[in-house]
């Protein structure tokens, strides 16, 4: 309750491919960064596929106010919700409600959050109460993952090549995040 969505558009994406955006310009503070040494999980291919770019899942863009108790954000935030099954991009509908989702005959592929980001929000509260500052966790992008037969969230397997955690330097790839956080809020919000 209290979540007001006033914009809802959808785009089709191909996760895990292409260039990653430049990070925002540095704030004028005393952040200091060093490039971390290489580490983490090497790229892998959980199952055979001729062209990963053939597979896609959908990001729904929602712009809405966020709330914390009786307090509401001064400005709306735009976030993503990962929607639907994954399948060959050529068979996915270009708009929600058109066509049919392709379902693989074998494992189930799910479109889930890939990366998260933090956004600062100021919350305005009723009755003259002091405003609050919070950092909200927002989905930054979606990806296709393979769902095991037990359909356990923690058992989601990567679909397509995935780099290890970005080794953070001047041009990092925003860090991959798991599927657990924020799912309940997103499911309840719409």
């Amino acid at each position: 309750q209290g979540w007001q969505a006033f914009k809802n558009d959808a785009t089709e994406i191909i996760p895990e491919l292409g260039e990653y955006p430049e990070p925002p310009p540095e704030l004028e503070n005393n952040k200091t960064m060093n490039r971390a040494e290489n580490g983490g999980r090497p790229p892998h291919h959980p199952f055979e596929t001729k062209d990963v770019s053939e597979y896609s899942c959908r990001e729904l863009h929602f712009t809405r106010y966020v709330t914390d108790g009786q307090c509401r954000s001064a400005k709306p935030v735009t976030e993503l919700v990962c929607s639907g099954q994954c399948g060959p991009a050529r068979l996915l509908p270009n708009a929600i409600g058109r066509g049919k989702w392709w379902r693989p005959s074998g494992p189930d592929f799910r479109c889930i959050p890939d990366r998260y980001r933090a956004q600062r929000v100021q919350l305005l509260c009723p009755g003259g109460a002091a405003p609050r500052a919070r950092k909200v966790r927002l989905v930054a992008s979606c990806k296709c993952k393979r769902l095991t037969r037990f359909h356990n969230q923690s058992e989601l397997k990567d679909f397509g090549p995935e780099a290890a955690r970005p080794q953070k330097g001047r041009k990092p790839r925003p860090r991959a995040r798991g599927a657990k956080a924020n799912q309940a809020e997103l499911e309840n919000a719409y």
């Epitope: 990070p23 925002p24 540095e26 704030l27 503070n29 005393n30 952040k31 200091t32 960064m33 060093n34 971390a36 914390d68 990366r115 998260y116 980001r117 933090a118 956004q119 600062r120 100021q122 002091a130 405003p131 609050r132 500052a133 919070r134 950092k135 909200v136 966790r137 923690s154 955690r165 970005p166 953070k168 330097g169 990092p172 790839r173 925003p174 860090r175 991959a176 995040r177 798991g178 657990k180 956080a181 924020n182 809020e185």
Partner: antibody, heavy 121, light 109 residues
Framework: EVQLVQSGAEVKKPGASVKVSCKVS????????MHWVRQAPGKGLEWMGG????????IYAQKFQGRVTMTEDTSTDTAYMELSSLRSEDTAVYYC??????????????WGQGTLVTVSS | QAVVTQEPSLTVSPGGTVTLTCGSS?????????PYWFQQKPGQAPRTLIS???DKHSWTPARFSGSLLGGKAALTLSGAQPEDEAEYYC?????????FGGGTKLTVL
Amino acid sequence: EVQLVQSGAEVKKPGASVKVSCKVSGYTLTELSMHWVRQAPGKGLEWMGGFDPEDGETIYAQKFQGRVTMTEDTSTDTAYMELSSLRSEDTAVYYCATDSAGYWYKFFQHWGQGTLVTVSS
Amino acid sequence: QAVVTQEPSLTVSPGGTVTLTCGSSTGAVTIDHYPYWFQQKPGQAPRTLISDTDDKHSWTPARFSGSLLGGKAALTLSGAQPEDEAEYYCLLDYGGTFVFGGGTKLTVL
């Protein structure tokens, strides 16, 4: 529930390096924002660095720039903090700390048990 | 780098009220510093009491509260208990870079 388990105590000589590990359970490391904090004997807490989810980068405290490296192994959900060119004043308990993966980012909610690093010749 | 200041020590009587403060060398502390308060007892890791100025955690006793007072972050303890004797640290967020205060040793007697 997030749980953090750190590696055991270390004794190092001046000039050497130390690498402390922090194993995450309950969530995957990629869902969390990991930070490192140290505490010298009888002294206060000192933030060394950590992952900033606003711009997707690991940020190091100015004091440790060039000496500290924070890395993560997502295959084992283990974070590492390596401090080089050790000196006696680096003798401290080193903590990893992380958020709780909620809708609102709340950092430093869960702490490891600490790793004592002693630097002595 | 900013310096975060706290009272080195404070004493409170059991059942009494005490306020710990946290100032910044860069000016007034605001909600945009997302002040944190931690409690640490000897031989233990710190634990978070307050995040984001005033947000309590499930394990935070109701007698603790966070606020901003006179350009500083404040932690108020109302109805002090013997088990509240500990070191208390504040932490401020300077745009992704964090700085701890020097800590306040709180004695309950």
